[in-house]
């Protein structure tokens, strides 16, 4: 995550420092479109992997147990093939003219329809979304190479549904139980979360308006991984680091155009799944088998 | 105090390469992307490209074939190289920060024999 | 590309007056546009970004507003320091792209 040298607090009277609020953002599109795109672009396919991942691919049953309440988790495990005609995402729901994410190459039209990963507009407006300052073009995020093949990676069936179980302190912990097909892994990030020191390299399509100076050979990631293991693993941010990471005062009400600069940076923490902790990594007193969710709010 | 300093030739031969170092203090390059815009007479205010925290680039297309952007964040340094200069390249090259009041002092690099 | 259009390249004004300066966007661009003071010899200077927001240390005689593909940037109580060229830009889409100018003289 780029870490701010300067003093945080800006000096803007929006109380946004717009030049850090467009580099974070793109920071965490690049985080995310490096995991899921290919060549510099999100496709449908992509798009349902980023979902099923921050599990809003499908609806979920959840069972909330009280202390007192010990019920086996055993019985969810189908959840996901009994909902799967709830997928509400089709190919043509998520074009807009926002130039940003694209989920196609739309090279013969000329027109460049991208979809902001946050967006509170209706999908189909012309670049209606005030808050991609970075524009919603510019934001042609950046790791967009072709390192994700949706056919490497793990079918929604194979995830199974989201269980929260309450402990006596009245926090939830989830659990996402997965089960993967023999022989297939979850790899994990690989991507650093600290920027390289020294780079030239543009890992992108002519067609956006970038340049591809090295071929793209790297072994893919598939798109399904625990959490974010790396030697630099992603924190887990609240929302007062939210907001001072992206140039944010923190007293200050957030407009619509301002929470839109959050958007990337909070679905990547998700991705990231960098809130939750395993419990063999960390002593805590919850149930066996569950990650727990660490307070960021 | 955040500073971006230019230092680059004035004068450059028609089809050869201009070659801008932007030298930032005040911030660092793993924080914010830097920006390249152009002003000419003829052409006003044209918006060149940017290089990322990561590293990573975006071009405007019209300059796409010719133009590269890189950096050094132990530096401070970002690295402007342009290729194939024509006399319609004259211009005055600046480096900025985003859309803010921190831009360079410009270079102005006249492309003639 | 998105054009941004400034249809007045000239505007003429008195000191003590009121004058507003426009921008047009080929397409909307929501609010995502800076509004850019330059004087000659000088690198553009960032008076408003997000149509509508000044950055510190800039007069509050200077107001911008607009969203979608209609700006204004107001000028009320002008100075003889405000004698400039005032360039609009948007950083919606790629390229971001700047609008032709409107140089302000002082009568």
């Known amino acids: 995550f780029p870490q701010t040298t300067e003093k945080i607090s800006p000096n803007w009277e929006s109380g946004i420092n717009v030049d850090l609020a467009i580099s974070t953002r793109q920071y965490h599109l690049q985080q995310l479109f490096y995991r899921y795109g290919e060549n510099n672009s999100l496709s449908v396919e992509g798009f349902r992997k980023l979902l099923q991942n921050i599990g809003i691919d499908k609806i979920k049953r959840i069972h909330i147990h009280h202390d007192h309440d010990h019920h086996s988790d055993h019985e969810h495990h189908s959840d996901h093939e009994r909902h799967s005609d709830h997928e509400h995402h089709s190919e043509h729901e998520h074009h807009s003219d926002h130039d940003h994410h694209s989920h196609h190459n739309h090279a013969a039209s000329g027109k460049n329809k991208r979809k902001a990963l946050c967006p509170d507009h209706d999908s189909d407006s012309s670049g209606k979304d005030p808050r991609n300052s970075q524009g919603k073009g510019a934001h042609r995020p950046e790791h967009a190479s072709g390192r994700r093949n949706v056919k490497d990676s793990v079918s929604a069936s194979e995830v199974t549904s989201t269980v929260y179980n309450t402990v006596s302190e009245g926090t939830h912990f989830l659990e996402t139980i997965e089960t993967p097909r023999p022989g297939k892994l979850f790899p994990k990030d690989v991507s650093s979360s600290t920027p390289p020191s020294v780079t030239s390299k543009s890992r992108v399509s002519r067609l956006a308006g970038r340049k591809t100076n090295e071929s793209v050979s790297e072994p893919r990631k598939g798109f399904m991984y625990s959490r974010n293991t790396n030697e630099n693993p992603q924190e887990c941010f609240n929302a007062s680091k939210l907001l001072t990471s992206h140039g944010m005062g923190i007293q200050v009400p957030l407009n619509a155009t301002e929470f839109n600069y959050l958007c990337p940076a909070i679905i990547n923490q998700i991705d990231a799944r960098s809130c939750l902790i395993h419990t063999s990594e960390k002593k805590a007193e919850i149930p066996p088998k569950t990650y727990s969710l660490q307070i960021a709010w | 105090q955040v500073q971006l300093k230019q230092s680059g030739p004035g004068l450059v031969q028609p089809s050869q390469s201009l070659s801008i170092t932007c030298t930032v203090s005040g911030f660092s390059l793993t924080t914010y992307g830097i920006h390249w815009v152009r002003q000419s007479p003829g052409k006003g205010l044209e918006w060149l490209g940017v290089?990322?925290?990561?590293?990573?680039?975006d071009y405007n297309a019209a300059f796409i074939s010719r133009l590269s952007i890189s950096k050094d964040n132990s530096k401070s340094q970002v690295f402007f190289k342009m290729n194939s200069l024509q006399a319609n390249d004259t211009a005055i090259y600046y480096c900025?920060?985003?859309?803010?009041?921190?831009w360079g002092q410009g270079t102005l690099v006249t492309v003639s024999a | 590309d998105i054009v941004m259009t400034q249809s007045q390249k000239f505007m003429s004004t008195s000191v003590g007056d009121r004058v507003s300066v426009t921008c047009k966007a080929s397409?909307?661009?929501?609010?995502?546009v800076v509004w850019y003071q330059q004087k000659p010899g000088q690198s553009p200077k960032a008076l408003i970004h997000?149509?509508?927001y000044r950055y510190s240390g800039v007069p509050d005689r200077f107001t911008g507003s607009g969203s979608g593909t209609d700006f204004t940037l107001t000028i009320s109580n002008v100075q003889s320091e405000d004698l400039a060229e005032y360039f609009c830009q948007q950083y919606n889409n790629y390229p971001w792209t700047f609008g032709g100018g409107t140089k302000l003289e002082i009568k």
């Open positions: 997000s149509a509508s």
């Open positions: 397409q909307n661009v929501d609010t995502n």
């Open positions: 290089i990322w925290t990561g590293g990573t680039t």
């Open positions: 900025a920060r985003g859309p803010s009041s921190y």
